[in-house]
């Protein structure tokens, strides 16, 4: 907290500019009008203020807006955003995707922080659902975002938003999350033709049931082993040797290298040895 002192003669700030970097903390407190600061927030980031000076500027904004900053100020916070606490951010009402992007840009390249998490939560709750543009933005900054949501939260994602999801956005999802996302993806991509459909649905297949895998095996999809290894064990177990051979196509030879790992290991144990022998891979059931 900075003491209230009168502004020295001739030092009253007329605008937010470079001259303010030479002001001591108490001079900033006394000589910079909070309303002026709020209207010229976009200039703050161009000026190399010290962290201590930024603390003073934040304090002035807090006094001006005790109930939370308006979006016009939030959008131009820039590096001052890093000074905000989750408690500060919970007072905000951020509705513009541009504001969200501007603040995420400040934290770019860093791990998710409590401040960013609070900001995202406030934004998404305000929107009511995770629309495509929001999801696009969040996964661009944080590829692990989608897989950090609970199955319950994911259930409110509309199928139309699935178009924004890239394969790498699903890398850290668990089977429970994919169980929720897969039916949405199936719905979103239902009008695509066979090969295009497989390219899009492939990264969601960790949530696919047996009957869908059987259907895919009839479509010459040539699923790679990496995708096969991510399938649900309970969905793979009922597949016949012939169906797995059709599903994997030329990649079927890769089963040998994975014979000790799930789901391949469990699937092998369910098959008749005679059927496994037809693959010519030396798999032992």
């Amino acid at each position: 907290e900075v003491e209230k002192t009168a502004c020295p003669s001739g030092k009253k700030a007329r605008e937010i500019d470079e001259s303010l970097i030479f002001y001591k903390k108490w001079e900033l407190e006394a000589c910079v009008d909070a309303a002026l600061l709020a209207t010229q927030m976009d200039r703050v980031n161009a000026i190399p203020f010290t962290y201590e000076q930024l603390d003073v500027l934040k304090h002035k904004l807090d006094e001006l807006y005790p109930q939370g900053y308006p979006e016009s100020v939030i959008q131009h916070l820039g590096y001052l955003f890093l000074k905000m606490s989750p408690e500060d951010i919970r007072k905000w009402n951020v509705t513009s995707l541009e504001t969200l992007k501007a603040l995420l840009e400040v934290n770019k390249g860093h791990e998710m922080s409590p401040q960013v998490a609070t900001l995202i939560d406030r934004f998404v709750k305000g929107r009511g659902q995770l629309d495509k543009d929001t999801l696009d933005t969040l996964t661009a900054f944080y590829p692990g975002y989608l897989c950090s949501l609970s199955p319950e939260e994911l259930s409110s994602v509309p199928p139309s938003s699935i178009w924004a999801v890239r394969p790498q956005d699903l890398d850290t999802c668990d089977p429970r999350q994919l169980d929720v996302l897969y039916p949405k993806a199936r719905l979103a991509f239902q009008n695509m033709n066979g090969s295009e459909y497989f390219v899009k649905i492939q990264s969601f297949l960790g949530g696919a049931p047996t009957e869908d895998l059987k259907a895919l095996s009839q479509q010459n999809v040539s699923m790679d082993l990496a995708t096969f290894m991510k399938l649900r064990t309970d969905a793979v177990l009922p597949l016949t040797v012939a169906e797995v051979q059709k599903l994997l196509g030329p990649h079927v030879e890769g089963l040998k290298a994975e014979e000790r790992h799930r789901p391949v290991r469990d699937w092998i144990l369910r098959q008749r040895q005679d059927d496994l022998d037809t693959l010519g891979l030396g798999l032992q059931g």
């Epitope: 998710m112 692990g144 975002y145 609970s150």
Partner: nanobody
């Protein structure tokens, strides 16, 4: 680098209760969970708790164990009731900074805390 420190393990009679705690250094946006390993057995997922507080439990502990987390303090707890001899194991806290897949790299593990239930 995230570090996880568990506490609260110990010995208890069958039918008794214990509360395990886990404190994380560093911010956890992804899942947190409890795993256990009994002598001679494979590691078993006990509970996974998502950031919104939704928890999923292994069938063997459903209704007896309750997991909760505090996102602001980066802590996780496991309330264990009606303990039996089969619950004897080393219990490990796990966390991901983002995401929830325990089977791929990026999982942080605690050192573990021993729980022993005698009948």
């Amino acid at each position: 680098q995230v570090q996880l420190v568990e506490s609260g393990g110990g010995s208890v009679q069958a039918g008794g209760s214990l509360r395990l705690s886990c404190a994380a250094s560093g911010y956890i946006y992804g899942c947190m969970g409890w795993f256990r390993r009994a002598p001679g057995k494979a590691r078993e997922e006990v509970a996974t708790i998502y950031r919104d507080g939704t928890a999923y439990y292994a069938n063997s502990v459903e209704g007896r164990f309750t997991a909760s987390r505090n996102n602001a303090e980066n802590t996780l707890s496991l309330e264990m009731n009606s303990l039996n001899a089969e619950d004897t194991a080393m219990y490990y806290c796990a966390a991901r900074t983002t995401g929830c897949n325990w089977d791929i790299s990026g999982v942080y593990w605690g050192q573990g805390t021993q729980v022993t239930v005698s009948s």
